[in-house]
């Protein structure tokens, strides 16, 4: 019970995770104007992974995509790639821990199976995880490093009178969702991978042992023992009645489908 | 058609107050940001603020700010501006103006003559 | 407070000549996220409220007629009517919408020569 328990939270949490990702990935509030000595703005100026948009007083947003490719700075790229990547492998990872959840039945699937997909996709959930929380770091450390450039060289003096303001950039909402859904899906990845060791069926294979008789010598060999874990894998002595009661183990809730001045 | 219809004339004593409305017409009302400028002696322009009539939410210049209230009724269309403490250079002539793109005020009321003698 | 500066304060212009007004403001207007710069120009003629000619320094709105244009960005930009017509006697006012609060030049009145 506590292992399925195990696996189907580690699966929830996983799930908000990555759509926490995907969220954060399709954001447009990466980084967003340092309002250091304007609270409130006439013209504020925020960036995304894929565009960038300004929002006026007026309350009209104006947004305009990176249309080039090879313009754009590496590390935006890599940020780009890291979090896709790990929502790639997140979709993975949810796919096929699916098929993996114990209170799903697929035909005649082996524990043994079950456990080594649930163990699959809590590697890849947490690879996902990190994917996204090193994405999301990378693009923090960027605004971090342009932020104090620009406020080295915040106002640069033309003619002695007139003052450029150079726009400084802070940590957008979507730093913040990326964290932690990367965390989320880091645990939920590391909840897949305990569930894994409670489902695999634990194989004790006794040494074969010799006796010496006085008389004649006779090899006693037991075969390998299945030892019976409370989450059998011997289905035979086991009835299963599609339409009646259920193991306790087997009555499980299936996961539910599912803007100034 | 746009329209911005404020209130008639106005004149107060000194330390009095005066709310001046601005009922809107001809488009969504909330869906524009409303200013309110003052001009006096017929020449100078000052912003006074902005009110988000979607939200209510409100900018004030410095120079106004403690003396201003903007407020909005959305079910009427209607911007409000007070002003409270009324001196005699608050005598002048105090227009509200619809906000569009680039933050240009599109569309002005006819304005309202707000007089504080001295 | 960004600060707004016209000249001339007053300008007498022949009908069918060009007219110029500069706007100068202490800072930039020109905003990076979308490379637009911040400036409106308005046209005041007596006992009548501003009316809106031109936004984001060189957009004109529509229904201004097209001898209104406007150019410049930064700090420093100009406003050209290109043959002066008899109804475009009036005041005209540059006023910085970027950063609050939002000022206004102190005008320029356009007189017939």
């Known amino acids: 019970m506590a292992v399925t328990a195990c696996q189907g939270l580690g699966f929830v949490v996983s799930l908000i995770g990555i759509a926490g990702i995907i969220a954060a990935t399709c954001m447009d509030q990466w980084s967003t104007q340092d309002l250091y000595n304007n609270p409130v703005t006439a013209v504020f100026n925020y960036q995304g992974l894929w565009r960038s948009c300004v929002r006026e007083s007026s309350g009209f947003t104006e947004c305009r995509g990176y249309f080039t490719l090879l313009g754009l700075p590496a590390m935006l790229q890599a940020v780009r790639a890291l979090m896709i990547v790990g929502i790639v492998l997140g979709a993975i990872g949810l796919l096929v821990s699916i098929f993996a959840l114990k209170c799903i039945r697929i035909g005649s699937m082996e524990d043994s199976a079950k456990a080594n997909m649930t163990l699959t996709s809590g590697i890849m959930f947490i690879v996902s995880g990190l994917c996204a929380i090193a994405g999301v770091s990378v693009f923090a450390n960027m605004l971090v490093t342009n932020f104090w450039m620009s406020t080295a060289n915040m106002y640069t003096g033309m003619g002695g009178m007139v003052q450029t303001v150079q726009t400084r950039y802070t940590f957008g909402a979507a730093l913040f969702v990326g964290w932690v859904a990367g965390g989320l899906t880091l645990i939920g990845g590391v909840m897949m991978c305990i569930a894994c060791r409670g489902l695999a069926p634990e194989e004790t294979n006794y040494k074969a042992v010799s006796y010496h008789a006085s008389g004649h010598s006779v090899a006693y060999k037991p075969g390998g023992f299945k030892a019976s874990t409370g989450f059998g894998s011997n289905t035979k002595n086991k009835k299963i009645y599609d339409g009646g009661a259920r193991t306790e183990d087997e009555v499980q809730s299936y996961p539910s489908k599912h803007d100034y001045v | 058609e746009v329209q911005l219809q404020q209130s008639g004339a106005e004149v107060k004593k000194p330390g009095a107050s005066v709310k001046v409305s601005c009922k809107a017409s001809?488009?969504?009302?909330?869906?524009?940001?409303m200013n309110w400028v003052k001009q006096s002696h017929g020449k100078n322009l000052e912003w006074i603020g902005l009110?988000?009539?979607?939200?209510?939410?409100?900018s004030y210049a410095q120079k106004f700010q403690g003396r201003v209230t903007m407020t909005r009724d959305k079910s009427s269309s209607t911007a409000y501006m007070e002003l409270l403490s009324l001196r005699s250079d608050d005598t002048a002539v105090y227009y509200c103006?619809?906000?569009?793109?680039?933050?240009?005020?599109?569309?002005w009321g006819a304005g309202t003559t707000v007089t504080v003698p001295s | 407070d960004i600060v707004m500066t016209q000249s001339p304060d007053s300008l007498a212009v022949s009908l069918g000549e060009r007219a110029t007004i500069n706007c100068k403001s202490s800072?930039?207007?020109?905003?990076?996220?979308?490379?637009?710069?911040?400036l409106t120009w308005y046209q005041q003629k007596p006992g009548q409220p501003p009316k809106l000619l031109i936004y984001?320094?060189?957009t004109r709105e529509s229904g201004v007629p097209d001898r209104f244009s406007g150019s410049g960005s930064g700090t420093d930009f100009t406003l050209t009517i290109s043959s002066l017509q008899a109804e475009d006697v009036a005041v005209y006012y540059c006023?910085?919408?970027?950063?609050?609060?939002?000022?206004f030049g102190a005008g320029t009145k356009l007189e017939l020569k």
């Open positions: 984001w320094a060189s």
């Open positions: 800072q930039s207007l020109l905003n990076s996220g979308n490379q637009k710069n911040y």
């Open positions: 001809g488009y969504s009302f909330t869906g524009y940001t």
């Open positions: 006023q910085n919408d970027y950063s609050y609060p939002l000022t």
């Open positions: 009110i988000n009539p979607y939200n209510g939410g409100t």
């Open positions: 103006a619809r906000m569009n793109y680039g933050n240009a005020m599109d569309y």
